[in-house]
């Protein structure tokens, strides 16, 4: 456990909330396309 | 977000434990520090728990303070016998040495 | 445990000017740039300014500059505004999982 602080940085963060942010953007637009093909 | 609760007025050597509940992210990837402020002071750092539940303190802090993990999405500060230079603004932090996501603090009184 | 000293402690400058604070660590921050900077009003919590030295926090304004690396670093706020009146500090982390604050800077914006 020398460093198992520094595991948890902003730069993983933020890259976390870009994967987040991108996932929702394209489950919401499936979700959207779907609805409408119905 | 990052919440702490659990601050009020105790007496010198009346053990007593803070909550921080974090929402929209799980301990399991998130390292927590406590820091305080005493009035009108600065910040100082107390210690931090890691992902995996390892604890670290400053070395002022180690035998007056306890920080655990009691949940997926709580970590608890107990201060051991406080005395009345413990009385300070306690926040809780997220982050690894950078400290990105804070709680608004919860203020904790010691004296007699 | 190590020491971060900040300088000065306090310090004046007129709307649009700059100011520079100072950071000196005891002992090298880890991987020589894990230093981060705070600013702080009165009855607020701090807020995330830099992060690494010289990286900002989203949505932080270019106006903030952080530099440095190993024990010395360096705050700079150019083009102050009214809103930038606060009190700042400097956090570094430390090998062996210890943490710690500098002792703040106030800046007065006049």
């Known amino acids: 456990h020398s460093d198992g602080i520094f595991t948890d940085s902003y730069s993983r963060y933020r890259k976390q909330m870009a994967v987040k942010k991108y996932l929702a953007a394209v489950l919401g637009k499936r979700y959207k396309q779907r609805v409408k093909n119905k | 977000s990052v919440e702490e609760s659990g601050g009020r007025l105790v007496t010198p050597g009346t053990p007593l434990t803070l909550t921080c509940t974090v929402s929209?992210?799980?301990?399991?990837?998130?390292?927590m520090s406590w820091v305080r402020q005493a009035p009108g002071k600065g910040l100082e750092w107390i210690g931090i728990?890691?992902?995996?539940?390892?604890t670290y303190y400053a070395s002022w802090a180690k035998a007056r303070f306890t920080i655990s993990k009691t949940s997926s999405t709580t970590v608890d500060l107990k201060m051991t016998s406080p005395t009345t230079e413990d009385t300070a603004t306690y926040f809780c932090?997220?982050?690894?040495?950078?400290?990105?996501?804070w709680g608004p603090g919860t203020l904790v009184t010691v004296s007699s | 445990d190590p020491v971060l000293t900040q300088t000065p402690s306090s310090v004046s400058a007129a709307v649009g000017g700059t100011v520079t604070i100072n950071c000196q660590s005891s002992?090298?921050?880890?991987?020589?740039?894990?230093l981060s900077w705070y600013q702080q009003k009165p009855g607020q919590s701090p807020k995330f300014l830099i992060y690494?030295?010289?990286n900002l926090a989203s949505g932080v304004p270019s106006r903030f500059k952080g530099s440095g690396s190993g024990t010395q670093f360096t705050l700079t706020i150019s083009d102050l505004e009214c809103d930038d009146g606060a009190t700042y500090y400097c956090?570094?982390?430390?090998?062996?999982?210890?943490?710690?604050f500098g002792g703040g800077t106030e800046v007065v914006v006049k």
């Open positions: 932090a997220r982050g690894g040495g950078e400290f990105f996501i």
């Open positions: 929209g992210f799980s301990l399991s990837s998130a390292a």
């Open positions: 728990i890691d992902d995996s539940g390892n």
């Open positions: 002992q090298s921050v880890y991987n020589n740039k894990w």
């Open positions: 690494q030295a010289s």
């Open positions: 956090a570094g982390g430390y090998r062996g999982n210890v943490c710690g």
